[in-house]
């Protein structure tokens, strides 16, 4: 049975040209993480493999940095970066957990961070 919970940074906003950290945290389970994938809609941004570490997709290597932890840092943001991001935790014995973050990239300097929330 999957008992874990993914906590994410939730709905967040950031300024165009700036950076943002996408963060997920898996809790309430003793499952071992074998790999974490970060995806934007249907595009793979990066993976962090338990054995072999971080691999940033060549299409994004100039604007994506690994970490902190199992999170992902997006740099040089553009309005086109607005959208849904998913952290996918592959674990055993539980299976797969998915967290969702919505990022809005704003033209102005009124970007504010949203509240944290949990996905069961």
């Amino acid at each position: 049975m999957m008992t874990g919970t993914i906590e994410t940074t939730g709905n967040i906003s950031a300024e165009k040209g700036g950076s943002i950290i996408l963060q997920c945290h898996l809790s309430s389970t003793t499952a071992q993480v074998t790999q974490v994938n970060w995806e934007q809609q249907d595009q793979l941004l990066a993976i962090c493999n338990a054995d072999l570490g971080w691999h940033i997709s060549p299409s994004f290597k100039d604007r994506v940095a690994p970490g902190p932890g199992l999170g992902l840092t997006l740099q040089s943001l553009t309005v086109n970066d607005t959208g849904e991001y998913f952290c996918i935790y592959h674990t055993y014995p539980d299976g797969t957990y998915t967290g969702r973050i919505f990022l809005e990239v704003l033209e102005s300097s009124v970007a504010e961070h949203g509240a944290r929330f949990q996905i069961p």
Epitope: T34, N37, I47, N49, G53, S57, P93
Partner: antibody
Framework: QVQLVQSGAEVKKPGASVKVSCKAS????????IAWVRQAPGQGLEWMGW????????NYAQKLQGRVTMTTDTSTSTAYMELRSLRSDDTAVYYC??????????????????WGQGTMVTVSS | DIQMTQSPSSLSASVGDRVTITCRAS??????LNWYQQKPGKAPKLLIY???SLQSGVPSRFSGSGSGTDFTLTISSLQPEDFATYYC????????FGGGTKVEIK
């Protein structure tokens, strides 16, 4: 076609080192991991470890820690496995194998779909 | 480390037989299990990955099932080229293989 071609058989004395090569062709070398697996005569398969051809990170079987080093040369699409302080029980066929999924597929890495032909390493005094 | 136990270690069968090989993990590994075929003097060949997915180019008479700790490889109708040794491999760290099952001609 996609293939891995390994270096030839080796005969070594106890205490020596051996370095086996594995040349990849037919695919983007840096998009996959390379594993090393060995098989002693008449025995089963033993996982030795693996290396990312993208970032060079390695993970070795605990029993081989300190004696094994895996490296890659991306300019020649070649992976190497060096085993030091050889003992008679290191006599085996050594295989390299490619991860069945690329790093960019999103699949969990773990199965190995393309294998080299094997390199026989004999350790004998 | 997670131990993988295959059974039987060997079996005799005839062409056309249905053959089942089992693999048991010492703890749950979800669906992180692969099956390989090896013929004498040759490298292993991937048959099944992620417990039940058929590798491209592998005949459909091969199938895999199971999750958690118990897994099965089935050959629905054994062919002459299927006489070989079969290995399971779990793909959670640190990766380990089962001891193998030799399928021989009866």
């Amino acid at each position: 076609q996609v293939q891995l071609v390994q270096s030839g058989a080796e005969v070594k004395k106890p205490g020596a080192s051996v370095k086996v090569s594995c040349k990849a062709s037919g695919y983007t070398f840096t998009s996959y991991a390379i594993a090393w697996v060995r098989q002693a005569p008449g025995q089963g398969l033993e996982w030795m470890g693996w290396i990312s051809a993208y970032n060079g990170n390695t993970n070795y079987a605990q029993k081989l820690q300190g004696r094994v080093t895996m490296t890659t040369d991306t300019s020649t699409s070649t992976a190497y496995m060096e085993l030091r302080s050889l003992r008679s029980d290191d006599t085996a066929v050594y295989y390299c194998a490619r991860s069945g999924s690329s790093f960019w597929s999103g699949d969990v890495l773990g199965a190995f779909d393309i294998w080299g032909q094997g390199t026989m390493v004999t350790v004998s005094s | 480390d997670i131990q993988m136990t295959q059974s039987p270690s060997s079996l005799s069968a005839s062409v056309g037989d249905r053959v089942t090989i089992t693999c048991r993990a010492s703890q749950s590994i979800s669906s992180y299990l692969n099956w390989y075929q090896q013929k004498p003097g040759k490298a292993p060949k991937l048959l099944i990955y992620a417990a039940s997915s058929l590798q491209s180019g592998v005949p459909s008479r091969f199938s895999g099932s199971g999750s958690g700790t118990d897994f099965t490889l089935t050959i629905s109708s054994l062919q002459p080229e299927d006489f070989a040794t079969y290995y399971c491999q779990q793909s959670v760290p640190p990766r380990t293989f089962g001891g193998g099952t030799k399928v021989e001609i009866k």
